[in-house]
Interface confidence: low
């Protein structure tokens, strides 16, 4: 079913290479879409013994990975850089790993800011 | 222009049943969670259920389970409540909205009268 | 479940006061609470969203802050079309939940 104007969404935005990338650093940011097509939002972040090193949040783009999915949940057992999605505004604000195979649930929840919306 | 249109109130008698209906336009439906919201008469607005994009997650307030059913059919792009064995305390507005880390889009509210 | 607190649940103000409604959670939800203001007869209109971020329209005299469990709804200068009644929601767990509703009238 076709529809008249982009559908919007919106997530937690982060980039840590944000000063080489000349982008902002951290904030809201309002995704658009093609017409017919789901929105979402990722975060992606690094596990260093246990520290948490954020990578890049954001907006992603139709993904039938992320379909229905409330919470951000990376599943891949011990990747180099984790990535997780999910559907509804501000669902990447807490992100998760939980290994398919099972073992312990580690969700990481960094603090509330009041960032600005990235237009 | 974004907008919910609802259907289906009026006067039932204590242990009927009644069906709701909400119409979105202006957006793609199939891409949000949409809940229903009551108020009662005089009082605050009480969350009564969720939905997810695809039907696939639903919740309810304890003060419905068991009696109200939340459904959806993105291909007829509408959200219906059913509501059995309804109480004199169900009397209320009922709202559809869409989302939920906000409900940014309302529907015009209708009227549910539970009485003999 | 959680429950959301308001306060004051009414008050009486006048054009260009500033108002400020709290809003506690029983138990911390992050920064997942939205404000909204309704008029009697009419659907609720979302204000704010994320504890603190202003919805499209909505003008700037209204802000959100707080996090964790408290958080509170400030009106910088009011406007006659202000005078409505103000509810939180907290969006972190269902079921989801109101705070009781704080009726701002004119004094």
């Known amino acids: 079913s076709g529809r008249g104007e982009a559908e919007t969404r919106e997530c937690i935005y982060y980039n840590a290479n944000w000063e080489l990338e000349r982008t902002n650093q951290s904030g809201l940011e309002r995704c658009e879409g093609e017409q017919d097509k789901r929105l979402h939002c990722y975060a992606s972040w690094r596990n260093s013994s246990g520290t948490i090193e954020l990578v890049k949040k954001g907006c992603w783009l139709d993904d039938f990975n992320c379909y229905d999915r409330q919470e951000c949940v990376a599943t891949e057992e011990n990747p180099q850089v984790y990535f997780c999605c999910c559907e509804g505004n501000f669902c990447n604000e807490r992100f998760t790993h939980l290994p398919e195979a099972g073992g312990p649930e580690v969700t990481y929840e960094p603090p509330p800011t009041a960032p600005t919306l990235l237009t | 222009q974004m907008q919910l249109v609802q259907s289906g109130g009026g006067l039932v008698k204590p242990g009927g049943s009644l069906r709701l209906s909400c119409a979105p336009s202006?957006?793609?439906?199939?891409?949000?969670?949409m809940s229903w919201i009551r108020q009662a008469p005089g009082k605050g607005l009480e969350w009564i259920s969720n939905i997810s994009n695809s039907g696939t997650n639903i919740y309810y307030a304890d003060s419905v389970k068991g009696r109200f059913t939340i459904s959806r059919d993105n291909a007829k792009n509408s959200l219906y409540l059913q509501m059995n064995s309804l109480r004199a305390e169900d009397t209320a507005v009922y709202y559809c909205?869409?989302?939920?880390?906000?409900?940014?889009?309302w529907g015009q509210g209708t009227t549910i009268t539970v009485s003999s | 479940d959680i429950q959301m607190t308001q306060s004051p649940s009414s008050l009486s103000a006048s054009v260009g006061d500033r108002v400020t409604i709290t809003c506690r959670a029983s138990q911390g939800i992050a920064n997942y609470l939205a404000w909204y203001q309704q008029k009697p007869g009419k659907a609720p209109k979302l204000l704010i969203y994320a504890a603190s971020t202003l919805q499209s329209g909505v003008p700037s005299r209204f802000s959100g802050s707080g996090s964790g469990t408290d958080f509170t709804l400030t009106i910088s200068s009011l406007q006659p079309e202000d005078f409505a009644t103000y509810y939180c929601?907290?969006?972190?767990?269902?079921?989801?939940?109101f705070g009781g509703g704080t009726k701002v009238e004119i004094k």
């Open positions: 929601q907290q969006v972190k767990s269902y079921p989801l939940s």
């Open positions: 909205a869409r989302g939920h880390y906000g409900m940014d889009i």
């Open positions: 202006g957006f793609t439906f199939r891409d949000y969670h």
